[in-house]
């Protein structure tokens, strides 16, 4: 079994390992999230994503988690167990992103653009919150991201 984000295949990443890393810090992260009325990875970001679109979307989302979320949270936390869990997630996200090569062909532009618009909906919601709250919420929503990604884990 492996991830199939449309035409983009990802080998060597097992969802169970991602879930185990997240579950280790889930309660801590979600307890720290004080803004329960808002969601970053809202339904409209992830629903009805076509297979072709999924490669672009997962690429932009995971890159954002790596460059903005994990990177900034790493500088803010000292709890060893939390750091270890997020390092596991980050390393696996790096492995996934490194294997994703979304097509840059012109005929794919409408699919690519739609994925970027979905991503912007997420990023704009993230940027509207203050940094601390946004990071906490994004980390607490890794389960939403993993649940969506798991749909693309196939034989």
């Amino acid at each position: 079994q492996e991830f199939h984000f449309g035409p983009c295949q990802v080998k060597g990443v097992v969802p169970q390992k991602l879930w185990e890393a997240f579950w280790a810090v889930k309660d801590t992260m979600q307890a720290q999230d004080n803004i329960t009325s808002a969601r970053l990875l809202q339904q409209e970001v992830l629903q009805n994503v076509s297979d072709a679109e999924s490669c672009y979307l997962v690429h932009t989302l995971l890159e954002f988690y790596l460059k903005t979320v994990f990177k900034n949270y790493h500088n803010r936390t000292v709890e060893v167990r939390t750091l270890k869990s997020f390092s596991t997630l980050a390393n696996n996200f790096v492995l996934i992103v490194s294997q994703l090569q979304p097509s840059q062909e012109n005929e794919m532009f409408s699919i690519r653009d739609s994925a970027h618009r979905r991503f912007l909906l997420f990023r704009r919601a993230f940027k509207q919150l203050d940094v601390e709250a946004a990071l906490t919420k994004a980390l607490g929503e890794v389960d939403i991201l993993l649940t969506w990604m798991q749909k693309f884990y196939k034989l």
Partner: antibody
């Protein structure tokens, strides 16, 4: 191809609320992942982004106008609207609505002139 | 609020090549800012040329191209035509909002 058209009063009195509507044809405002923007251009000056309503109905505004701006949509009429409160003569401008490509306007309306004067 | 900078004016000879740039006051411009470029002639509504750094809007001639050059977004016109004389604006996404630059007036002479 999608087309957008602005409408509303051409003259508004100071301290009142400016209300403009953008009517969309050639496609539904709820189809796809598109966002819908308002931009304005004071006479002889550059473009100023005012705000956007995303496909899920969430809204985002320019920090400098946030306290006075509201964007909403009426999906049954395939329209989205701009309200700008407490207007002054500095709000005199051509107001444009647009459908976004990605994070920036793609298809623009012809614009509607709004003058703020008593 | 972020400030987006553009050259106030530039000129190019017909058939020549010109590059317009778009910078951010506080940081480098990257593809994550989704740079867009717009052309406006007097009395007309703006027209979208480029969005998402490099994507040409439908119907835009291939002589217009977008890129990131150094720490700025860039619009290059290769083989400028007399009808390219206009004001050019860039726009950058700054997270939860968008900002336009002050515009560049391009003269073709």
């Amino acid at each position: 191809e999608v087309q957008v058209q602005e409408s509303g009063p051409g003259l508004v009195k100071p301290s009142q609320t400016l209300s403009l509507t953008c009517t969309v044809s050639g496609g539904s405002i709820t189809t796809g992942t598109y966002s819908w923007s308002w931009i304005r251009q004071p006479p002889g000056k550059g473009l100023e982004w005012m705000g956007v309503i995303a496909y899920d109905g969430s809204t985002y505004y320019s920090p400098s106008l946030k306290s006075r701006t509201s964007i909403s949509r009426d999906t049954s009429k395939n329209q989205f609207s701009l309200q700008l409160s407490s207007v002054t003569p500095e709000d005199t401008a051509v107001y444009y609505c647009a459908r976004d490509d990605v994070a920036a306007p793609g298809y623009w309306g012809q614009g509607t002139q709004v003058t703020v004067s008593s | 609020q972020a400030v987006v900078t553009q050259e106030p004016s530039l000129s190019v000879s017909p058939g020549g090549t010109v590059t317009l740039t778009c910078g951010l006051s506080s940081e480098s411009v990257t593809t994550s800012n989704y740079p867009g470029w717009f052309q406006q002639t007097p009395g007309q509504a703006p027209r979208t040329l480029i969005y998402s750094t490099i994507s040409r809007h439908s119907g835009v001639p291939s002589r217009f191209s977008g890129s990131i050059s150094g720490n700025k977004a860039a619009l290059t016109i290769t083989g400028a035509q007399p009808e390219d004389e206009a004001d050019y604006y860039c726009a950058l996404d700054i997270g939860s909002y968008t900002v336009f630059g002050g515009g560049t007036h391009l003269t073709v002479l």
